[in-house]
């Protein structure tokens, strides 16, 4: 004969476990329903009844099957050096990303909680390293016979013309001038970009770290100050 | 031990000023790279301004002009000079360290608080 099907609450096997998408509770020694996506338990399941569940309320979500009391907050609104890539629903949280010619100072599970702009190098320095998602650009002095002279996020220093007859020598801020006779260069003239970050959806995905230091660390450094609490607010 | 104390807010009205300090101990002040990062009520943080080891620094749109960053390497003080303050700059004012080449904040002081009334 076939097994009977147990309906919600049943008394588990001893030593056995709940079946998916229900929950052992302690108080009824029953095995209960969880809750979907976007629910959270509203009445826990006692020996005769099921766990009732409700709706997240608004800027609240639950993204898992679960029997939590309350839905989580969604987190803080995104400011205005962040891009909201994906909204706050009953069933999962908002993510901020950062802007264009920004960069994640201080990550979080998903997404950024925040952006700094990315360091614009100054006349006579240029880009050692380029900018990423989450991580600032590195200037460095232009080397004797290079030059920048922008302040730029992309710009990296670039080789003197090579002049025939120097008019003016070039320095790590200015080329050179040459007399009216053709100069030749080893590259092409104008500024010289890197490429700029192309911003795409978190891939912020470790756990969020002891709260003792700010999130994404992995420098060994004593362990300081922790970032503000984060605030959460309804839309 | 590593701290960040934050001092030199208050209460202000519309257009006044005020220079924040942070004090920073316990680290090497000049290998970082120092911020500050406000956090209005109910909001996230935002980034203010930055100041870099050759002394460049950085604003952010909202306050440009208005907003000096300076530091003091032999005193280890961050400071920011706060000028025509507008009711929207209400907020904690947090000052940050990023050690050079890591890209993440690391400490973080407790935060001073600045109230601008209209």
């Known amino acids: 004969l076939p097994a009977q099907v147990a309906f919600t609450p049943y008394a588990p096997e001893p030593g056995g476990t709940c079946r998916l998408r229900e929950y052992y509770d302690q108080t009824a020694q029953m095995c209960c329903s969880k809750c979907p996506p976007g629910q959270h338990a509203k009445v826990f399941c006692t020996k005769t009844s099921d766990t009732v569940c409700d709706s997240c309320e608004d800027s609240t979500y639950t993204q898992l099957w679960n029997w939590v009391p309350e839905c989580l907050s969604c987190g803080s609104r995104c400011s205005s050096d962040q891009v909201e890539t994906q909204a706050c629903t009953r069933e999962q949280n908002r993510i901020c990303t950062c802007r264009p010619g920004w960069y994640c100072a201080l990550t979080k599970q998903e997404g950024c909680r925040l952006c700094a702009p990315l360091r614009k190098c100054r006349p006579g320095f240029g880009v050692a390293r380029p900018g990423t998602e989450t991580s600032d650009v590195v200037c460095k002095p232009c080397a004797p016979g290079t030059f920048s002279n922008t302040t730029s996020s992309t710009d990296i220093c670039r080789p003197h013309q090579i002049c025939n007859v120097v008019a003016v020598p070039g320095n790590a801020s200015m080329d050179a001038v040459c007399t009216s006779t053709s100069p030749t260069r080893s590259m092409a003239p104008g500024p010289v970009h890197l490429p700029q970050p192309v911003s795409t959806r978190s891939q912020h995905t470790q756990p969020t770290p002891a709260p003792s230091t700010a999130p994404g660390t992995s420098f060994l450094l004593p362990v300081g100050p922790s970032p503000p609490a984060e605030g959460s607010t309804g839309d | 031990h590593v701290q960040l104390v934050e001092s030199g807010g208050g209460s202000v009205q519309a257009g006044g000023s005020l220079r924040l300090s942070c004090a920073a101990s316990g680290f090497t002040f000049s290998s970082y790279y120092m911020s500050w990062v406000r956090q209005a009520p109910g909001k996230g943080l935002e980034w203010v301004s930055a100041?870099?080891?050759?002394?460049?620094?950085n604003y952010s749109d909202s306050v440009k002009g208005r907003f000096t960053i300076s530091k003091d390497n032999a005193k280890n003080t961050l400071y920011l000079q706060m000028n025509s303050l507008k009711p929207e700059d209400t907020a904690m004012y947090y000052c940050?360290?990023?050690?050079?080449?890591?890209?993440?904040?690391?400490?973080w002081g407790q935060g001073t608080q600045v109230t601008v009334s209209s």
């Open positions: 940050a360290a990023i050690r050079i080449g890591t890209d993440q904040y690391k400490f």
């Open positions: 100041i870099y080891s050759d002394d460049s620094d």
